[in-house]
């Protein structure tokens, strides 16, 4: 976990002010509106059944 303004989060994660820690970019498929997703290069779309089973 990284504090903002220090070393960046590890590859595949991005800083979340809401969570106060680095968060997994993979989570952006499920939680695309999370603040940290803005820092993730590409949030892949959710499979159809995950959102609307």
């Amino acid at each position: 976990e990284q504090a903002p303004g220090t070393a960046p989060c590890s590859r595949g994660s991005s800083w979340s002010a809401d969570l106060d820690k680095c968060a997994d970019c993979a989570s952006c498929r499920a939680r695309p509106h999370s603040d940290f997703c803005l820092g993730c290069a590409a949030a892949p779309p959710a499979p159809f059944r995950l959102l609307w089973p």
Epitope: C25, S27, R29, A30, A42, P47, L50
Partner: antibody, heavy 119, light 111 residues
Framework: EVKLEESGGGLVQPGGSMKLSCVAS????????MSWVRQSPEKGLEWLAE??????????HYAESVKGKFTISRDDSKSRLYLQMNNLRAENTGIYYC??????????WGQGTTLTVSS | DIVLTQSPASLTVSLGQRATISCRAS??????????MQWYQQRPGQPPKLLIK???NLDSGVPARFSGSGSGTDFTLNIHPVEEEDAATYYC?????????FGGGTKLEIK
């Protein structure tokens, strides 16, 4: 310290109903997806139901095996999760875990409450 | 539904050695970027505990002797060096779609 505490388990006759409760503390309950997971010797770990956030209009999802029989709900003001179970059968016997996850995994688990369906 | 098959069902590993547990999914649970597979540890009488999310990402507080790898349909949990406290049952779980499913578990014993 994160804590999830289930209650409401016990012995119920086949065809009966039961409502499980779970009270959460130590994390921002209203920002976490919540689920119920059952464990039994016969079927191992089974995800049963999930409820998402207010911003998702509290969307719910169920395993086929419990769809129409179980209802998951939450009360964010009380940091509580519920599972209403109707028309219970022997195969619903097991340990019921309350779980919370920021997304599509289970970060936090309660100690579980045991449900026994038997005559 | 996606079926997760774990192997072996049980294994015994000497203290300090490597434990390797496999999980095979009946269909791919990966995109080009991420894999939607988790690993949990369950000690006797306790609930499961999240170890690894998205195939490779260690949960906070989990010792670095645990590692996850794999993509597509084949995933692996490695523990090295194994310690006495690692005696437990380990489960994989996918989050590719609903319903989420778990593997049948692998019981690890330490000698």
């Amino acid at each position: 310290e994160v804590k999830l505490e289930e209650s409401g388990g016990g012995l119920v006759q086949p065809g009966g109903s039961m409502k499980l409760s779970c009270v959460a503390s130590g994390f921002t309950f209203n920002n976490y997806w919540m689920s119920w997971v059952r464990q039994s010797p016969e079927k191992g770990l089974e995800w049963l139901a999930e409820i998402r956030l207010k911003s998702d209009n509290y969307a719910t999802h169920y395993a086929e095996s419990v769809k129409g029989k179980f209802t998951i709900s939450r009360d964010d003001s009380k940091s509580r999760l519920y599972l209403q179970m109707n028309n219970l059968r022997a195969e619903n016997t097991g340990i019921y875990y309350c779980t919370g996850g920021f997304a599509d995994y289970f970060d936090y688990w309660g100690q579980g409450t045991t449900l026994t369906v038997s005559s | 539904d996606i079926v997760l098959t774990q192997s072996p069902a049980s294994l015994t590993v000497s203290l300090g050695q490597r434990a390797t547990i496999s999980c095979r999914a009946s269909q791919s649970v990966s995109t080009s970027s991420y894999s939607y597979m988790q690993w949990y540890q369950q000690r006797p009488g306790q609930p499961p505990k999240l170890l690894i999310k998205y195939a490779t990402n260690l949960d906070s507080g989990v010792p670095a002797r645990f590692s996850g790898s794999g993509s597509g349909t084949d995933f692996t949990l490695n523990i090295h060096p194994v310690e006495e406290e690692d005696a437990a049952t380990y489960y994989c779980q996918h989050s590719w779609e609903i319903p989420y499913t778990f593997g049948g578990g692998t019981k690890l014993e330490i000698k």
